[in-house]
């Protein structure tokens, strides 16, 4: 059973992930970023279901494409280089989803733009955090 300290750790990791995703979204949504329009030509795959930490497998599988798109942005709105930012997210995702069980991600039929993709995972983090508090 999860202890209060492990729950707290999970909550802090989710909050860190949430902040990273929000930072990316704010960076690319900045109205001064002329690259956003071209970033919208990239497709991202969305999870059919995202209600548990194991579903973060679907986010992990899309991190490489996300990094490639962020490399386009050349944005001063990010404090870190895309490679470092995605690396940080990857570490958190791996810790949160755990590696004990291998979960096969199921994707929805509809794809998403980078903005829709980030919003979906931001909502996921907020939802899980709310169940922990």
């Amino acid at each position: 059973a999860p202890t209060s300290s492990s729950t707290k750790k999970t909550q802090l990791q989710l909050e860190h992930l949430l902040l990273d995703l929000q930072m990316i979204l704010n960076g690319i949504n900045n109205y001064k970023n002329p690259k956003l329009t071209r970033m919208l030509t990239f497709k991202f795959y969305m999870p059919k279901k995202a209600t548990e930490l194991k579903h973060l497998q679907c986010l992990e599988e899309e991190l490489k494409p996300l990094e490639e798109v962020l490399n386009l942005a050349q944005s001063k709105n990010f404090h870190l280089r895309p490679r470092d930012l995605i690396s940080n997210i990857n570490v958190i995702v791996l810790e949160l989803k755990g590696s004990e069980t291998t979960f096969m991600c199921e994707y929805a039929d509809e794809t998403a733009t980078i903005v829709e993709f980030l919003n979906r995972w931001i909502t996921f983090c907020q939802s899980i955090i709310s169940t922990l508090t």
């Epitope: 002329p34 329009t37 071209r38 030509t41 990239f42 497709k43 494409p65 386009l72 794809t111 733009t113």
Partner: antibody
Framework: QVQLVQSGAEVKKPGESLKISCKGS????????IGWVRQMPGKGLEWMGI????????RYSPSFQGQVTISADKSISTAYLQWSSLKASDTAMYYC????????????WGQGTMVTVSS | SYELTQPPSVSVSPGQMATITCSGD??????AYWYQQKSGQAPVLVIY???KRPSGISERFSGSSSGTVATLTITGAQVDDEADYYC???????????FGGGTKLTVL
């Protein structure tokens, strides 16, 4: 209303220079990419390149890099396509078009400028 | 350089379904857009982001994408739908875009 108005048809001789224009109105000209598209007689559409008038960031198709110059003057909301030395093979209809800010496709098109190069 | 491949022509009878395909290596990761160009006119966007319709475009136009192939479908084709149709997408660098060769749709 949002529109792009292009300069009139041109008839030129090989070796001459030319600059055609595309004036935007009804929207914030500096906040949208403007692209140029070529259509040779009886042929398909060819993407030539795009420019972001806000900072003049420009991208060219490899086929047109070095052959044409895309520029913009944001003070008069106008984009340009120019040639320093025209060839007969430049004879075509040239369209300018605006990239939508919300879904990255050309949503507004100019009426086209017919350029004829003949000796 | 990146290429999108379309059939040169498609013919259907009025009321039938017309299907136009577009294949490109980057399409699993890049959206396809479709333009209609009638004779002597500037192109008009009919589908964006694989399957979305801009406002003012008939519901008879739909789009889909699977793997490296994007598809434009016109249900209940009408004589007024006769036009050239072009798919459009961007290479994986995001810097360079390309039109397919175009497909002439004949409704007879």
């Amino acid at each position: 209303q949002v529109q792009l108005v292009q300069s009139g048809a041109e008839v030129k001789k090989p070796g001459e220079s030319l600059k055609i224009s595309c004036k935007g109105s009804g929207y914030s000209f500096t906040s949208y990419w403007i692209g140029w598209v070529r259509q040779m007689p009886g042929k398909g559409l060819e993407w030539m390149g795009i420019i972001y008038p806000g900072d003049s960031d420009t991208r060219y198709s490899p086929s047109f890099q070095g052959q044409v110059t895309i520029s913009a003057d944001k003070s008069i909301s106008t984009a340009y396509l120019q040639w320093s030395s025209l060839k007969a093979s430049d004879t075509a209809m040239y369209y300018c078009a605006r990239l939508s800010g919300s879904y990255s496709a050309f949503d507004i098109w100019g009426q086209g400028t017919m350029v004829t190069v003949s000796s | 350089s990146y290429e999108l491949t379309q059939p040169p022509s498609v013919s259907v009878s009025p009321g039938q379904m017309a299907t136009i395909t577009c294949s490109g290596d980057a399409l699993p990761r890049k959206y396809a857009y479709w333009y209609q160009q009638k004779s002597g006119q500037a192109p008009v966007l009919v589908i964006y982001e694989d399957s979305k319709r801009p406002s003012g475009i008939s519901e008879r136009f739909s789009g889909s994408s699977s793997g490296t192939v994007a598809t434009l479908t016109i249900t209940g084709a009408q004589v007024d739908d006769e036009a050239d149709y072009y798919c459009f997408s961007t290479d994986l660098s995001g810097d360079r875009s390309v039109f397919g060769g175009g497909t002439k749709l004949t409704v007879l």
